[in-house]
Amino acid sequence: RKIPKVGHTFFQKPESCPPVPEGSMKLDTGIINENQRVSMSRNIESRSTSPWNYTVTWDPNRYPSEVVQAQCKHLGCINAQGKEDISMNSVPIQQETLVLRRKHQGCSVSFQLEKVLVTVGCTCVTPVVHHVQ
Amino acid sequence: GIAIPRNSGCPNSEDKNFPRTVMVNLNIHNRNTSTNPKRSSDYYNRSTSPWNLHRNEDPERYPSVIWEAKCRHLGCVKADGNVDYHMNSVPIQQEILVLRREPRHCPNSFRLEKILVSVGCTCVTPIVHHVA
């Protein structure tokens, strides 16, 4: 799927934009907001009633090279007594992010945008009960 | 892809700091994941730490629409529907990469940007600080 262009009246005249080969886009890899930090509460993955573990996958042909995925520890949720309550469900919360995938064509190293679905954590939900007629 | 492939033991990359600027194929490789979390699941309503989803739209960014979660309560919802303030609803945050049009309004020129999004909420046991 191509990156959608917003209404053309909104754009600057082409001469004020950098020239880009057909079918490509120019991407500056200097990252904006590089030094902002996730201000999440401490250790929420272990304090949650739907706790989760993290696994990291590393790939030298991707930027960023590491992608962190959460996995819910239980099917149910942890109750006040610290026991698993299977009348509730631990479910994954997912978010889409972009990564750059390195490609090789002839003598050129290029990049392709890729959407990756990341499981960020888990939440405890009331199950959907399907009643059989 | 980017530049036209050349043969005979490919030439140097001109820029010593390659690739500060890279050419990127415009076709996005992905499974067609839904960008509207309301459509993909109703966890935001069924969770013991429910959240509201706010649409953040910016035509200078790709993706232009990002949904931000805001926890509805400080506490967590019990089975009887009441809020238990002995537990806390907290946002789950994630840093994601997006593209920012640079220069502004240019259709095919971007810069990477990291943004922090709240994806949903989870119910946690509070950290209790005892005063001596």
Epitope: P60, N61, S65, R102, H104 | G9, N17
Partner: antibody, heavy 119, light 107 residues
Framework: QVQLVQSGAEVKKPGASVKVSCKAS????????LHWVRQAPGQGLEWMGI????????NYAQKFQGRVTMTRDPSTNTVYMELSSLTSEDAAVYYC????????????WGQGTTVTVSS | DIQMTQSPSSVSASVGDRVTITCRAS??????LAWYQHKPGKAPKLLIY???SLQSGVPSRFSGSGSGTDFTLTISSLQPEDFATYYC?????????FGGGTKVEIK
Amino acid sequence: QVQLVQSGAEVKKPGASVKVSCKASGYTFTIYYLHWVRQAPGQGLEWMGIINPSGGRTNYAQKFQGRVTMTRDPSTNTVYMELSSLTSEDAAVYYCARGEFSSGWLDYWGQGTTVTVSS
Amino acid sequence: DIQMTQSPSSVSASVGDRVTITCRASQGISSWLAWYQHKPGKAPKLLIYAASSLQSGVPSRFSGSGSGTDFTLTISSLQPEDFATYYCQQANSFPLTFGGGTKVEIK
């Protein structure tokens, strides 16, 4: 221009730990991954691990797991590699090297730090 | 882990000679291979990346080829400054791994 400057030579006793630093300059520190590679006398190059200077996340070669710790200090654009429980087999020249944008090959290298392990 | 096997382990050659070094991966690595030159007391230097792309500032007498499992580094006309040890390195997956090295010596 891009430069990676490492700390000086170290002499350590078996069982001790060593911490080598690598100060980066001439580029945006947090964008490029940093690797550690070593070369023991008469041996080839051996990859030890990688650190993302942005978040500090690391990936270590299995051989060094549990013994190596890579850290970074973005305020000084410096990365560190600490190796514990040293034996004579850890005597080597240790290099830090910058991974190009998506981290797979190493385009700039530090000058190397010689670590001698002897009782 | 992917094993990288380099051959020969050493080669004696004269200035002006054409030198070929080969590198074999234990599994397919597409074109994700780099070549380095290493001289005693110096830091290794990246020569070739992505199997055949010449790193900036590297003389054109160095060239690389191959994909999949078999790769070659060629020095078309050996110069006095080229006497060194050459290493291949796979960049396909972690852990990154190097070949054992090929020492190019003066005949």
